[in-house]
Structure formats: structure tokens, C-alpha cells
Interface confidence: low
């Protein structure tokens, strides 16, 4: 009876997400059969988040809109480990928008989800950011320094990375 009601709850939760994500990939968390964490198919998962690499080229704002339609945001990178995971799925000859911008051009960088910007956990390429008119951040590959961040003009179309919390059912 308990298992039945749990299954009914799961199904209704899945229906909720179906309008955005017709297919979810779920894994059992730990040893408890009750706890499943899911990411939309074909998103990738790391710790408590799901990630999607959007290969369509759009401006920063349009990229953020594209993520938000899917219930996500442009990616907020909180740790070196998270960045190391993300770059495994990126192409070296491409650039990808992050959820980091400086709307006023005053070097007040801010993350889209209001996570405080911590100068100690940033991965700018050396010499970056370097232009007050370049108010959006990308991650790209430079042969000398591998993967890092760069500031660019927000209207220049780029690929992007979306991030959302895992769905727990």
C-alpha cells in the first residue's frame, strides 16, 4: 500500500515534467529504493545538477531564454570539479556562454541565479576579463592555458551550457 501510493506520487511528478522533458533518465540514489534522481534525456548529470550543451548559436540573452524554457539557467560554475566535468562534453574549437554577466559594464559580475560572485572561484584566462564593453562570459579553449573564461560582447552568437537541479522522484 505504501509502495503503491509512492508510485502514484512518482507518476504525477513525472507528468508534471513531461511538458518540458518527454524523457527522463533516472538513477537510484544510494541504497534506498525510494530515492531516484533524474535528468532529462539526453542531459548529463554531475552531483545534484543536470547539464545540457546547446549547440545552436544565439546571443547571451536568447541563450538564457532557451535554458529557462527548459526549466534551467545558463550554467553557474561553483567549483573546479564542476568545471572539469563540464569541459569533458565541450568541443575545443567552440565557445559556450556561461550564466555570468556584467550588465552595467562596471566589472560587477553576477551569476544568473544570484549566486554571489566569488573572485576566488573564477577561471578566467590570463588577461581576462579585459574589456568593459564585453559584458558576458564564455568558456573556451586556449592551447596555452586549456579551458578558461573570457568576456565577450553579449550579442555575438555562441553555443551555451544550461544547468538545472536534478529532479527527485
Amino acid at each position: 500500500n505504501f509502495m503503491y501510493s509512492k508510485t502514484v506520487k512518482r507518476l504525477s511528478k513525472l507528468r508534471e515534467y513531461q511538458q518540458y522533458h518527454p524523457s527522463l533518465t533516472c538513477v537510484m540514489e544510494g541504497k534506498d529504493i525510494e530515492d531516484w534522481s533524474c535528468c532529462p534525456t539526453p542531459w548529463t548529470s554531475f552531483q545534484s545538477s543536470c547539464y545540457f550543451i546547446s549547440t545552436g548559436m544565439q546571443s547571451w540573452t536568447k541563450s538564457q531564454k532557451n535554458c529557462s524554457v527548459m526549466g534551467a539557467d545558463l550554467v553557474v560554475i561553483n567549483t573546479r570539479e564542476e568545471q572539469d566535468f563540464i569541459i569533458q562534453n565541450l568541443k575545443r574549437n567552440s565557445s559556450y556562454f556561461l550564466g555570468l554577466s556584467d550588465p552595467g559594464g562596471r566589472r560587477h559580475w553576477q551569476w544568473v541565479d544570484q549566486t554571489p560572485y566569488n573572485e576566488n572561484v573564477t577561471f578566467w584566462h590570463s588577461g581576462e576579463p579585459n574589456n568593459l564593453d564585453e559584458r558576458c562570459a564564455i568558456i573556451n579553449f586556449r592551447s596555452s592555458e586549456e579551458w578558461g573564461w573570457n568576456d565577450i560582447h553579449c550579442h555575438v552568437p555562441q553555443k551555451s551550457i544550461c544547468k538545472m537541479k536534478k529532479i527527485y522522484i
Epitope: S59, T61, K62, Q64, S68, P103, R135, C136, H155
Partner: nanobody
Framework: QVQLQESGGGTVQPGESLRLSCEVS????????MAWFRQATGKDREFVAA????????VYGDSVKGRFTMTRDHPKKMVYLQMDNLKPEDTAVYYC??????????????????WGQGTQVTVSS
């Protein structure tokens, strides 16, 4: 259908003030980022000011910083642009614009989904 209607334009002398209003007819007003742009005859459209959905954040174009103030009134679904110490170079048609993604407010006119018809502001002695 979202509609934006500007008002409050007119002719003033240098150093005087004007207040532009933009009425937004949509139930989703509180989720829109809003902006003002202007276009002088023969020139490109220029970013003036923008405000985030909550009204907590505002951004101003370099040429109006310290003189113009943008605010919004959620219950009235209105956006305002208070323009003080006006200069002849402020003469232009002023447009109100709305962006569906209220969390972002860049001064890029390509990003705004809705536009008003504009109101003329002339600063002349």
C-alpha cells in the same frame, strides 16, 4: 498580446525636465525586464536605460548617467523615465521595450520582444 504605449514627450528648453511614461498591457508585466531606447533622425537606435523585472537593478547608457532615472510601478503596470537637465543632444524619438526574460537586462535592442510606437522629445532653445 502585449502592448506598450509611451506618453509624456514634448518640447522643452535645455536644462529642463520631462517624465516619460510607458503603459504595458499584459498580465505578465511583473516578469518583464523593461528598457528605454531612443533614435535621433538619421542615427542608430541608442540604449538609454533598462530595469530588471523586480525593479531592483537598473542600467543606464553612458550619455544619460546621472541625469535620467528609470523606475517601474507594478500595480499600475507602468514604466517611467525621469529626464532631468535635458540637452539638445537628447532630442529623439523615445521607445519603450519589454523583454520576456526579466532576469536579463542588456542594452541590446535585438533582445527585446515587445516595442511601443515611440514618443518624440525635442530639446531646443
Amino acid at each position: 498580446q502585449v502592448q506598450l504605449q509611451e506618453s509624456g514627450g514634448g518640447t522643452v528648453q535645455p536644462g529642463e525636465s520631462l517624465r516619460l511614461s510607458c503603459e504595458v498591457s499584459t498580465d505578465t508585466f511583473s516578469s518583464l525586464a523593461m528598457a528605454w531606447f531612443r533614435q535621433a533622425t538619421g542615427k542608430d537606435r541608442e540604449f538609454v536605460a533598462a530595469i530588471s523585472w523586480s525593479g531592483a537593478s537598473t542600467v543606464y547608457g553612458d550619455s544619460v548617467k546621472g541625469r535620467f532615472t528609470m523606475t517601474r510601478d507594478h500595480p499600475k503596470k507602468m514604466v517611467y523615465l525621469q529626464m532631468d537637465n535635458l540637452k539638445p543632444e537628447d532630442t529623439a524619438v523615445y521607445y519603450c521595450a519589454g523583454d520576456l526574460d526579466g532576469r536579463t537586462w542588456h542594452g541590446d535592442d535585438l533582445e527585446y520582444d515587445y516595442w511601443g510606437q515611440g514618443t518624440q522629445v525635442t530639446v531646443s532653445s
